[in-house]
């Protein structure tokens, strides 16, 4: 969480951003909140990006003002116009690109004063893994697949019964480049699996960590997966 204060002649206002990560090809949100004002026409929101000449987005006098918008953001940004009055200056970003990563500044002017806060935005690809029993294999084998990751992640297997065991000798992980030539499909195979055990396939890069669990018993198979972003810090 980054909290910024204005320091000009006017009073300063508190602006708060949250560092976040964008999944390439999907939409992202750059979070920013501020002390609200009574009149929408008195609020100015400017989003800027370090190293970019034009503005990312500007909202003032109750409407978007994009005459100074940088080319890389054209047609790709929007504020939540109906929420500006309650202090939400968050920015929606369409079709996140790798090049969108960087330091952004959320700069606010209201009748109470000015304020700004920076936001670190990381971009990459992350997806939920799915673990299945590979019935085609000659021995009991598990197959963990996740369709989109970037940068290349690490894959680690773990088991509930053999806690702390190193499965690197009995597993094989491959990375297959997807058609857009950036993200990769992750496939990891674990051999010599025993029943009545829960196995976890953990995929991690510097942006996200995802886990796919599978519990294999004689009577049933149970699956569970979750994904967590690693860099959500507020400022």
């Amino acid at each position: 969480l980054i909290i910024g204060f204005g320091i000009s002649g006017r009073h300063s206002i508190t602006v708060t951003t949250v560092a976040s990560a964008g999944n390439i090809g999907e939409d992202g949100i750059l979070s920013c909140t501020f002390e609200p004002d009574i009149k929408l026409s008195d609020i100015v929101i400017q989003w800027l990006k370090e190293g970019v000449l034009g503005l990312v987005h500007e909202f003032k006098e109750g409407k978007d003002e994009l005459s100074e918008q940088d080319e890389m953001f054209r047609g790709r940004t929007a504020v939540f116009a109906d929420q500006v009055i309650v202090g939400n200056a968050s920015l929606r970003l369409k079709n996140v690109q790798l090049t969108d990563a960087g330091t952004y500044k959320c700069y606010i002017i209201t009748s109470k004063g000015k304020g700004n806060a920076n936001l670190e935005y990381k971009t990459g690809a992350f997806s939920m893994p799915e673990v299945n029993v590979d019935y085609n294999a000659s021995s009991e084998t598990l197959r963990c697949e996740a369709p989109r990751w970037f940068p290349q992640p690490t894959v680690v297997w773990a088991s509930q019964v053999d806690q702390g065991a190193n499965f690197s000798e009995v597993s094989n992980t491959s990375f297959e480049l997807n058609s857009e030539n950036v993200t990769m499909k992750v496939v990891s195979v674990l051999y010599n699996v025993t029943i009545n055990n829960t196995y976890s396939c953990m995929i991690e890069n510097d942006i996200a960590k995802a886990t796919g669990d599978i519990k294999v018993t004689e009577s049933e198979i149970k699956r569970r997966s979750h994904l967590q972003l690693l860099n959500s810090k507020a400022s």
């Epitope: 090809g25 999907e26 939409d27 034009g54 987005h57 409407k63 978007d64 003002e65 994009l66 005459s67 100074e68 918008q69 940088d70 080319e71 054209r74 047609g75 790709r76 940004t77 929007a78 929606r92 369409k94 079709n95 058609s179």
Partner: antibody
Amino acid sequence: QVQMQESGPGLVQPSQSLSITCTVSGFSLTSYGVQWVRQSPGKGLQWLGVIWSSGSTDYNAAVISRLSISKDTSKSQVFFKMNSLQPDDTAIYYCARDITTIVEGFAYWGQGTLVTVSS
Amino acid sequence: IIVMTQSPKSMSMSVGERVTLSCKASENVGTYVSWYQQKPEQSPKLLIYGASNRYTGVPDRFTGSGSATDFTLTISSVQAEDLADYHCGQSYSYPFTFGSGTKLEIK
């Protein structure tokens, strides 16, 4: 309320150029981009290009060598110029505006101007 | 270029029937698909944007669904005034593209 209106020549000689003006009201050209779409007789819609609030443009590669879009923000007018027209450019030409500043659906359309390319 | 394929090309339905129109994208377009209704001699009108958001003033019998490559426009109980061409379009990446349309006729 938002309104868009195209005005064009109707008939264009083959190999000549086409100029259409789209006059908008109810919003500022510094807030929204203006899209251009055409519809050939009995055919589907074809996106041709857009001029953004900043004045920068994006064109369909199929017409990029022949198309130029510009604007006069103070007059709320957008200008569409296409060169070297051929009979298969005969179509209704529309200007349109998106629902938000992110392109996710063309909510406002002009009435269209029918352009016939014939000698 | 992302190709948008609509099916069927045309259909004839009775008033009150449920209508399902399909639109398939040749590659992932997220939820950046919109649906338009075009009546004879009129400009297209936006029905659905963002794959599933009904535009202001559009009757709730029109519903959009889908993501990635498969999209559907459903008219829960078709009315006589729904006679029109229906177009889907993608605005995920350049060039923005449209399907060739579905003509809906009322029996």
